[in-house]
């Protein structure tokens, strides 16, 4: 794609530091801790990517439309030959008009028959659809609304029970890791206590007695 934004897509630019002029900037410093992990993509970059995606989508749609036009052209060229009038006399042109009128009449008849078939099919489809709904116990599909969804919830929705297992496992792994670090900390603490105890009189006494 001959577009200038392709290089920008490779290396995200760092967001410029806020200019300390407006009170809103200070409010941001007050409410958000400085150590907070910054978003990987800046707002401007997000916008740039969105624009790029829209551009790609637009090009795709245009390409599809062009393909459809080409397909239509090809279909018409096979059905309708170009008028080759060069050298044909008045007699042939009159005859040709008769031929074309006859062809138009024939095509009209065919179109009428096809339309009748299509109407019949539509009616049949409608009847069958109704029967399906009747068999389902007149089940009415709820209207779908857009909802915000977390990554975990999306995973769960996509993978079902398997996702739940993997999520539980991940939580379990985190838990185990936490317990291990606590245990290590406890052991380190006890060892220090022991050293302190031995270094005092009590320790000397115990040492002497032993």
């Amino acid at each position: 794609m001959a577009d200038g934004s392709s290089d920008a897509a490779r290396e995200p630019r760092p967001a410029p530091a806020p200019i300390r002029r407006r009170s809103s900037n200070y409010r941001a410093y007050a409410t958000e801790p400085h150590a907070k992990k910054k978003s990987k993509i800046s707002a401007s970059r997000k916008l740039q990517l969105k624009t790029l995606l829209l551009q790609i989508a637009k090009q795709e749609l245009e390409r599809e439309a062009e393909e459809r036009r080409g397909e239509k052209g090809r279909a018409l060229s096979t059905r309708c030959q170009p008028l080759e009038l060069a050298g044909l006399g008045f007699a042939e042109l009159q005859d040709l008009c008769r031929q074309l009128h006859a062809r138009v009449d024939k095509v009209d008849e065919e179109r009428y028959d096809i339309e009748a078939k299509v109407t019949k099919n539509i009616t049949e489809i409608a009847d069958l659809t109704q029967k399906i709904f009747d068999l389902r116990g007149k089940f009415k599909r709820p209207t779908l609304r857009r909802v915000r969804i977390s990554a975990d919830a999306m995973m769960q929705a996509l993978l079902g029970a398997r996702a739940k297992e993997s999520l539980d496992l991940r939580a379990h792994l985190k838990q185990v890791k936490k317990e291990d670090t606590e245990k290590e900390n406890r052991e380190v603490g006890d060892w220090r206590k022991n050293i302190d105890a031995l270094s005092g009189m009590e320790g000397r006494k115990k040492k002497f007695e032993s």
Partner: antibody, heavy 119, light 113 residues
Framework: EVKLEESGGGLVKPGGTLKLSCAAS????????MSWVRQTPEKRLDWVAT????????FYPDSVKGRFTISRDNARNTLYLQMNSLRSEDTAMYYC?????????????WGQGTLVTVS | DIVMTQSPSSLAMSVGQKVTMSCKSS????????????LAWYQQKPGQSPKLLVY???TRESGVPKRFKGKGKGTKFTLTISSVQAEDLADYFC?????????FGAGTKLELK
């Protein structure tokens, strides 16, 4: 110089078939409508068939419709006439003719002819 | 079908004489949209193929001598040779190019005295 040369004529039995050819030169063949015209032994001229420049449109008199087929090969600059179910009344000198320019009328150029005898 | 009738079927003329031959159609050959009559005249010399002389009833084909003149409109047409020459010895055919099937007259045979 416009040149039209017919070939393929000969003696054939009634009910037989024959294919005539007409080699064209000296003009842009694919730009002109072409026709076959025959002349009976009594010197009467009969129009046999016409084909448009690209071959999409074809015209015949009732006397040959369903028996004769006109066709052309623009790549080879050749006009054809396939004659099936030949009858004694088809005996004639067969000429291939080039139509005039679009703003004019009539058969501007004729070949020397090829003789077809059905007997 | 349009029937083309030519008269006379033959004529014998001396060199330098004026000749007029006639051609009648069973229906009008006039195209009202362009006011042109779709009639052509052909000359066929012995042992040769036909040659176009006149189209649109009165338009002389390029290379055709001026002594050949076509006239008429609707259903009545004539071909006149103002001063017959020895090389004009031939059969002359009229043809309608107004409607299919394209039809020819039976011809007029020009002979020299």
């Amino acid at each position: 110089e416009v040149k039209l040369e017919e070939s393929g004529g000969g003696l054939v039995k009634p009910g037989g078939t024959l294919k005539l050819s007409c080699a064209a030169s000296g003009f842009t063949f694919s730009s002109y409508a072409m026709s076959w015209v025959r002349q009976t032994p009594e010197k009467r001229l009969d129009w046999v068939a016409t084909i448009s420049s690209g071959g999409s449109y074809i015209f015949y008199p009732d006397s040959v419709k369903g028996r004769f087929t006109i066709s052309r090969d623009n790549a080879r600059n050749t006009l054809y006439l396939q004659m099936n179910s030949l009858r004694s009344e088809d005996t004639a000198m067969y000429y291939c003719a080039r139509h005039h320019n679009p703003d004019k009328s009539g058969f501007a150029y004729w070949g020397q002819g090829t003789l077809v005898t059905v007997s | 079908d349009i029937v083309m009738t030519q008269s006379p079927s033959s004529l014998a003329m001396s060199v330098g004489q004026k000749v007029t031959m006639s051609c009648k159609s069973s229906q009008s050959l006039l195209n009202s949209s362009n006011q042109k009559n779709y009639l052509a005249w052909y000359q066929q010399k012995p042992g040769q193929s036909p040659k176009l002389l006149v189209y649109f009833a009165s338009t002389r084909e390029s290379g055709v001598p001026k002594r050949f003149k076509g006239k008429g409109k609707g259903t009545k047409f004539t071909l006149t040779i103002s001063s017959v020459q020895a090389e004009d010895l031939a059969d002359y055919f009229c043809q309608q190019h107004y409607s299919t099937p394209l039809t020819f007259g039976a011809g007029t045979k020009l002979e020299l005295k």
